[in-house]
Amino acid sequence: KEPKFTKCRSPERETFSCHWTDAVHHGLKSLGPIQLFYTRRNIQEQTQEWKECPDYVSAGENSCYFNSSFTSVWIPYCIKLTSNGDTVDGKCFSVDEIVQPDPPIALNWTLLNVSLTGIHADIQVRWEAPPNADIQKGWMVLEYELQYKEVNETKWKMMDPILSTSVPVYSLKVDKEYEVRVRSKRRNSRNYGEFSEVLYVTLPQ
């Protein structure tokens, strides 16, 4: 089985990494070393200048990491995997297409009010943007999606995406425990990042 790209991801538009599957040959790793080559646009060069991955270590096994010196959102990239000189997989993209922010952090909640009947309560959930997202300068404008559910349920309820880092959640049952999680994406992007750690909400009787 030949290696294949599984994912390229940029957490903050300033670096990115690409990952691929192991090469497997009859249950053993392929003898040919896997190399990643990349090229940035091909207008001036008469022939495409392919350069080898600058860092095979930082993003883990079967990966290539491009630090900020190798990353620009203003040019197209093409990458290819080679084994014994043969190309086994390839793809082209712009950095903005692979932006998937790190999870939001520091989730917490406060009680807003309890219904007159004492059956339902409203809460305010707050969080912080991923630390590496440069949101102050507008380089990363993030949209957040909050999901919640009762602890014993399997289906998450999704709230509409918002730009703020806090949102009220209405009509929770006071005798239940809830799980809340938040993820983000760059505005106008299609790719959400991973969810935050789950916040557990237990409403007082």
Epitope: S68, S72, W74, I75
Partner: antibody
Framework: EVQLVESGGGLVKPGGSLRLSCAAS????????MDWVRQAPGKGLEWVAE??????????YYAESVKGRFTISRDDSKNTLYLQMNSLKTEDTAVYYC??????WGQGTLVTVSS | EIVLTQSPGTLSLSPGERATLSCTAT???????LNWYQQKPGQAPRLLIY???NLASGIPDRFSGSGSGTDFTLTISRLEPEDFAVYYC?????????FGGGTKVEIK
């Protein structure tokens, strides 16, 4: 040989609109990222907008100074790039260059915004 | 955004002399994403050097580029009459693409 030919410039009153066109040849236009860059009389160069290829979802980007007023678009079947300019201001007066990812440039078309 | 400051604003030299043009960025720019352009009166800019030090096609080797971080240099080893023009540096690394204010190389 890469060729970029702009047209559509002219004199327009403040608040008015204008649409610039750029006819491209000598390269695979549908694969190209295209930009508009402008130059006010006697001044330096200012990047205005970019549109990417279909493979890159025709994503568009704008300078803050034109965001919400200018729209970059393309017609790959006609090998043509466009810049729709609305709510024009006197400070938009400039020669507008069509560029292939800022590597190859057309000769430019002059836009004058004046009452 | 990254602001590029070019110096000097004007450089007065004679043909055959060496020209050294400077471009300073307000924050670090990867050498892969810095270009130089030449513009003659009434003409469009022309790409001279891409990625700090690579000559664009058809550009004579009397032009060279160097630098890293925040400081970049365009050098013309021996000025020819056709080299008198305005030169712009350009970065497309971070923020939106920006250009320097230009250096005019004029005949002394």
């Amino acid at each position: 040989e890469v060729q970029l030919v702009e047209s559509g410039g002219g004199l327009v009153k403040p608040g008015g609109s204008l649409r610039l066109s750029c006819a491209a040849s000598g390269f695979t236009f549908s694969d190209a990222w295209m930009d508009w860059v402008r130059q006010a009389p006697g001044k330096g160069l200012e990047w205005v907008a970019e549109i990417r290829s279909k493979a890159n979802y025709h994503a568009t980007y704008y300078a803050e100074s034109v965001k919400g007023r200018f729209t970059i678009s393309r017609d790959d079947s006609k090998n043509t790039l466009y810049l729709q300019m609305n709510s024009l201001k006197t400070e938009d007066t400039a020669v507008y260059y069509c560029t292939l990812i800022r590597d190859y440039w057309g000769q430019g078309t002059l836009v004058t915004v004046s009452s | 955004e990254i602001v590029l400051t070019q110096s000097p604003g004007t450089l007065s030299l004679s043909p055959g002399e060496r020209a050294t043009l400077s471009c300073t960025a307000t924050s670090s720019v990867s050498s892969s994403y810095l270009n130089w352009y030449q513009q003659k009166p009434g003409q469009a800019p022309r790409l001279l050097i891409y990625s700090t030090s690579n000559l664009a096609s058809g550009i004579p080797d009397r032009f060279s580029g160097s630098g890293s971080g925040t400081d970049f240099t365009l050098t013309i080893s021996r000025l020819e009459p056709e080299d008198f023009a305005v030169y712009y540096c350009h970065q497309y690394h971070r923020s939106t693409p920006t250009f320097g204010g230009g250096t005019k190389v004029e005949i002394k």
